[in-house]
Interface confidence: low
């Protein structure tokens, strides 16, 4: 399937123009490529009329340009003076030649209609209304008024001033005058539809000395918007209808042959087939709203609706926009896993893909839930703490630039099983859609920490170990301290690795952590896990309390556990030690309204990057007052 | 005066058929927007299936797709709904609802039991 897109069918009249958008994959190579528009004839062949080499045809000399915009991924194709000879197919393309990647596009040019030379022309969209101006004689100020729609063989009545209403026109059509000017009457038709297109006869009086004015109504669908998007990609559709409708049910649907199917609306109607990844949002008081929908998929290519009725279902009459989505599968947007599969009291770890070119975006993880019209709260960000609830379960490791961040979820429950959202501050199309399921653990976990009740006695010596099976032998094995900035890595090192796979002692495979003297600041969440360069895997996390020793009795109360934790982890034995940099609270992220939920998802505001050390390896700062710290293998 | 007068509704053993209609009177069912909501008890109102003025696309709730059918008989200004292959979970009060000129008029409703 050829990757280029633009409008399938373009119309117009003789002596207008018309500006044709084709859109390509954003590519370097495309982007410097020739662009062309030809005509296809009978044989097959496809003549070019002109191309941005600077070809340009005979016939097109003098009326039509082709203008590529890089940065767009777009050309456009403007053609004046069109005739009906110009009516036929075309294509739009690129390439050297004209058998390259190319989109056909069919061009009607139509005779302007012969009209009565008095005929006043309305233009109005389906389902908005019109006010037609009917003019008429001081004369004829006590006589009827009327507005009738020509057929083929009269002019049947819509409305007049005795009251008398057409049924087809009950509730819609009103005939009125304004303040005392007896010159003049209007009729307002609302909700209009195709079948109200025509003309239109308005008079005053009868016989020979009525005035009358002939009218002709044209009632336009709405123009479909393209929309070229990648695969895995994330669209929004912005709709404005008007305040006229701000009060009522707005929907999304996607056209089917006659029918257009309901995908989403605000009374709670949602396709199971955007389960997970789509949200509606109203924006304002004036009936704009948009729907987002993330994980685009080759599918969802089609023809969308929007409109607003109270019954939330597309309605005759009613205003609606339209759009022509194109989904490409020439994607720059990773194929990563869409369904990441966990078990009880284990953990995941998830790559989020990111627009490499905004390595300094502020990333961010989201859960959506499907109530009302969709949301997505955030649960943890680079400069959004975590959520209370994943307290010591949940961080965000960045890995400036390479295009990836991971959020690590770990003491899992079947509650957390659903669809989460990876996305940024930046370019909005790579909001991506994981589903998260969680199954029963069925077998002891991969790591397991000695001592499971961890309670580190104030002033003391303190060892935790973390154990691991042969098969994590070659991977990069660490502890971190985490707090609701992220998990700070502690330096490590691993001697286990060093054995050869044939050699592993299952029973030896430890990584342990030494607090030596135990201090207030080491309470906290410690995390154990396993990585390979930047790719996290398994996890485990341990809660340490800190008690005092008191006569009495052995141990006191542990204090809060958000305590902020001053751990190190250092080869053998070196007389140093590690804490972390101050935490300071940071304020909410301001990317979305409503607190911590991503709502107004379509126009999130540019943030200035706070130098947050959230997630990073290296968040710990030496000091110099010493301590001994023991890593055992 | 508006006046939507629904009938037909009454007790079915399970996989039975109904049919459901819609008496309207001041207003013409060729040109107004009618709608099917029913009521389980101890439940809030939920649209079963609708149908547009020009009649060519009638809408149906997931659950009732395939079972279910929306016909207007214009003559005799009448809309009906009918239904088969019924099932307990569609026990409910069926009201018709009609959307003329930006207002909603509503039926005094018809209970439909399935039950064995």
């Known amino acids: 399937k050829s990757p280029i897109f633009g409008p399938q069918e373009v119309s117009s009249i003789e002596g207008d123009s018309v500006s044709i958008t084709c859109y390509y994959p954003d590519t370097s190579v495309n982007r410097h490529t020739r662009k062309y528009w030809c005509r296809q004839g009978a044989s097959g062949m496809c003549t070019t009329l002109i191309s941005s080499n600077g070809y340009l045809s005979k016939e097109y000399s003098g009326r039509a340009n082709l203008i590529n915009f890089p940065e767009n991924n777009t050309f456009v194709i403007n053609i004046e003076q069109l005739t009906q000879d110009d009516t036929g197919s075309y294509k739009c393309g690129l390439g050297t030649s004209n058998r390259g990647l190319s989109f056909d596009v069919s061009l009607e040019v139509s005779q302007v209609p012969e009209l009565p030379s008095d005929t006043h022309v309305y233009t109005k969209d389906i389902g908005r209304n019109v006010t037609i101006e009917c003019p008429f004689k001081r004369e004829n100020a006590p006589s009827k008024k009327s507005l009738c729609k020509k057929t083929n063989q009269s002019c049947e009545l819509v409305i007049d001033s005795t009251e008398k209403v057409n049924p087809s026109y009950i509730g819609r059509a009103k005939l009125f005058m304004k303040g005392t000017d007896l010159t003049v009457f209007y009729v307002n038709i609302s909700h209009l539809t195709h079948n109200d297109a025509g003309l239109y006869i308005c008079q005053a009086g009868e016989g020979p000395s009525a005035d009358k004015k002939n009218v002709d109504l044209q009632v336009l669908a709405p123009e479909p918007e393209l929309l070229y998007k990648d695969l895995r990609s994330s669209v929004t559709f912005e709709c404005d209808l008007g305040r006229e409708v701000a009060n009522e049910a707005k929907y999304l649907c996607r056209m089917n042959k006659e029918t257009c199917d309901v995908i989403i609306n605000t009374l709670g109607k949602r396709d199971p087939d955007f389960e997970g990844r789509i949200l509606i949002t109203p924006k304002d008081d004036n009936g704009r709203f948009s729907v987002l929908i993330t994980g685009l998929r080759k599918e969802d290519a089609g023809h969308y609706q929007c409109g607003a009725h109270s019954s939330g279902l597309p309605q005759e009459g009613w205003p609606i926009q339209t759009w022509q989505l194109f989904v490409n599968e020439e994607s720059t947007i990773p194929n990563r896993r869409s369904v990441v599969k966990g078990v009880t009291g284990g953990s995941v770890a998830i790559a989020c893909p990111y627009n490499p070119k905004e390595s300094s975006s502020l990333k961010y993880w989201c859960r959506w839930e499907g109530d009302g019209n969709g949301h997505c709260p955030v649960l943890v960000g680079t400069q959004a703490q975590v959520q209370e609830e994943y307290e010591g379960r949940l961080a965000l490791f960045d890995q400036p630039g390479n295009g990836t961040y991971t959020v690590i979820l770990n003491q899992l429950t079947t509650e957390d099983a659903g669809f989460y959202w990876c996305l940024t501050n930046g370019d909005s199309r790579w909001r991506t859609t994981i589903e998260l399921q969680v199954a029963e653990a069925t077998r002891e976990p991969n790591l397991e920490v000695t001592p499971q009740n961890a309670t580190a006695v104030l002033g003391e010596t303190f060892t935790v170990s973390c154990h691991y099976p042969c098969k994590f032998y070659s991977q990069e094995k660490y502890w971190c301290k985490w707090s609701n900035k992220g998990c700070h890595i502690l330096p490590s090192h691993d001697e286990g690795a060093r054995q050869s796979s044939v050699s592993c002692d299952q029973s030896s495979q430890l990584v342990s952590m030494t607090l030596n003297p135990v201090s207030k600041e080491d309470e906290g969440w410690y995390w154990c896990g396993v990585k390979q360069g930047q790719t996290y895997g398994e996890t485990t996390a341990i809660y340490i309390a800190v008690e005092e020793r008191t006569r009495g009795s052995s141990h006191v109360n542990p204090t809060d556990a958000n305590a902020r934790a001053k751990v190190a982890l250092e080869e053998e034995v070196v007389d140093s030690s590690i804490s972390e940099k101050e935490n300071k609270a940071i304020p909410n992220p301001g990317p979305f309204a409503n607190e911590r939920e991503i709502q107004n998802v379509g126009d999130q505001a540019q943030e200035n990057r706070a130098s947050g050390d959230a997630g990073s390896a290296d968040g710990q700062s030496r000091s110099s007052s010493s301590k001994h710290h023991h890593h055992h293998h | 005066q508006v006046q939507l007068v629904e009938s037909g509704g009454g007790s079915v053993q399970p996989g039975g058929s109904l049919r459901l209609s819609c008496a309207a009177s001041g207003i013409d069912v060729s040109i107004s927007t009618i709608m099917w909501y029913r009521q389980p008890p101890g439940r809030q109102r939920e649209l079963v299936a609708d149908?547009?003025?020009?009649?060519?696309?009638?809408t149906y709730t997931e659950s009732v797709k395939g079972r279910f059918t929306v016909t207007r008989d214009n003559a005799k200004n009448t809309v009906y709904l009918q239904m088969s292959g019924l099932k307990p979970e569609d026990t409910a009060v069926y009201y018709c609802?009609?959307?003329?000129?930006?207002?909603?008029?509503w039926g005094q409703g018809t209970q439909v039991t399935v039950s064995s």
């Open positions: 149908v547009i003025p020009s009649g060519r696309s009638t």
């Open positions: 609802n009609a959307f003329v000129r930006r207002e909603n008029y």
